[in-house]
Interface confidence: low
């Protein structure tokens, strides 16, 4: 679990505790829903999503979904509750600090999905686990 921020004033509807009783608060995720993407045949991509949002519910994590078919490539960025399936798949890696893509079986397309639990972690989607960017400029994605 990502260590929680200490909050001075808490709305009751925001209070959620992890297994150790620590209070968790909503995290920041890229949230552009589905957009066309140029990410293809790369070890890692930036989302190019210009919207950073704080998830509605404290238990939600960041999710990215990369899809390729005969016509286009899309990248979906959202918040989602890991207790619930997304695109019919369980978010197995929701506790990961990085968004490491895993291929899922979907007829008629190539489908990768990742989830993660650190702020804006679905901004940098990783297709190769050993990949580690050394260029900080790549991480500077303007947000709103």
């Amino acid at each position: 679990t990502i260590p929680p921020h200490v909050q001075k004033s808490v709305n009751n509807d925001m209070i959620v505790t992890d297994n150790n009783g620590a209070v968790k608060f909503p995290q920041l995720c890229k949230f552009c829903d589905v957009r066309f993407s140029t990410c293809d045949n790369q070890k890692s991509c930036m989302s190019n999503c210009s919207i950073t949002s704080i998830c509605e519910k404290p238990q939600e994590v960041c999710v990215a979904v990369w899809r390729k078919n005969d016509e286009n490539i899309t990248l979906e960025t959202v918040c989602h509750d890991p207790k619930l399936p997304y695109h019919d798949f369980i978010l197995e890696d929701a506790a990961s600090p990085k968004c490491i893509m895993k291929e899922k079986k979907k007829p008629g397309e190539t489908f990768f999905m990742c989830s993660c639990s650190s702020d804006e972690c679905n901004d940098n989607i990783i297709f190769s686990e050993e990949y580690n960017t050394s260029n900080p400029d790549l991480l500077l994605v303007i947000f709103q």
Epitope: S9, S50, I51, S53, I54, L140, F143
Partner: antibody
Framework: EVQLVESGGGLVQPGGSLRLSCAAS????????MTWVRQAPGKGLEWVSV????????AYADSVKGRFTISRDNSKNTLYLQMNSLRAEDTAVYYC???????????????WGQGTLVTVSS | DIQMTQSPSSLSASVGDRVTITCRAS??????LNWYQQKPGKAPKLLIY???SLQSGVPSRFSGSGSGTDFTLTISSLQPEDFATYYC?????????FGQGTKVEIK
């Protein structure tokens, strides 16, 4: 109660520098992105800059890029705007504002300071 | 940058009137549209976010609608404290841009 109090404004000559501060209280500072917005006398609102809660991500309006630097000290609950190479057209009231915390409010500034006036003139 | 155009730039109205202000974006911004009220010498105040969501503490006579490129702020029954300048702002992409403002004056 959320409070944002700006300071550091004043009269400065063209080409000069100024550092604005914004002291925040009443909320958890480090989970909110913060922005600076300015308003020239008798004119409308102009967004200047934004910084993420951790300070790791920043963005600037083209009109100030390369001259202004936004930063924050989360241990002091303080937001800063370092303004260099100031021009007459930078004359404005500068507001610090908090970005909202929930999904669709994330792009809206839900609390604003009272503003501090920066006058660039010889 | 996305351009935001408000109309009218000013209007005169009486207490009790229904007032409508429109805002048009130069491209689709989905529902990422916010409305602010500003009184002379004061900081702006958030009224509406996400096109139609009323900010906490804002009277229910204020409402917002629209999506895509066309948006509306409505004050159902103008009160004396509502005479101010109103700004729309898109938060779809950086830089977030404001409309030029609509000044609501007493008739």
């Amino acid at each position: 109660e959320v409070q944002l109090v700006e300071s550091g404004g004043g009269l400065v000559q063209p080409g000069g520098s100024l550092r604005l501060s914004c002291a925040a209280s009443g909320f958890t500072f480090d989970i909110n992105a913060m922005t600076w917005v300015r308003q020239a006398p008798g004119k409308g609102l102009e967004w200047v800059s934004v910084i993420s809660g951790s300070g790791g991500t920043t963005a600037y309006a083209d009109s100030v890029k390369g001259r202004f630097t936004i930063s924050r000290d989360n241990s002091k609950n303080t937001l800063y705007l370092q303004m260099n190479s100031l021009r007459a057209e930078d004359t404005a009231v500068y507001y610090c504002a908090r970005r909202g915390q929930y999904r669709y409010i994330a792009g809206a500034t839900d609390y604003w300071g009272q503003g501090t006036l920066v006058t660039v003139s010889s | 940058d996305i351009q935001m155009t408000q109309s009218p730039s000013s209007l005169s109205a009486s207490v009790g009137d229904r007032v409508t202000i429109t805002c048009r974006a130069s491209q689709s911004i989905s529902s990422y549209l916010n409305w602010y009220q500003q009184k002379p010498g004061k900081a702006p105040k958030l009224l509406i976010y996400a096109a139609s969501s009323l900010q906490s503490g804002v009277p229910s006579r204020f409402s917002g609608s629209g999506s895509g490129t066309d948006f509306t702020l409505t004050i159902s029954s103008l009160q004396p404290e509502d005479f101010a300048t109103y700004y729309c702002q898109q938060s779809y992409s950086t830089p977030p841009t404001f409309g030029q403002g609509t000044k609501v004056e007493i008739k």
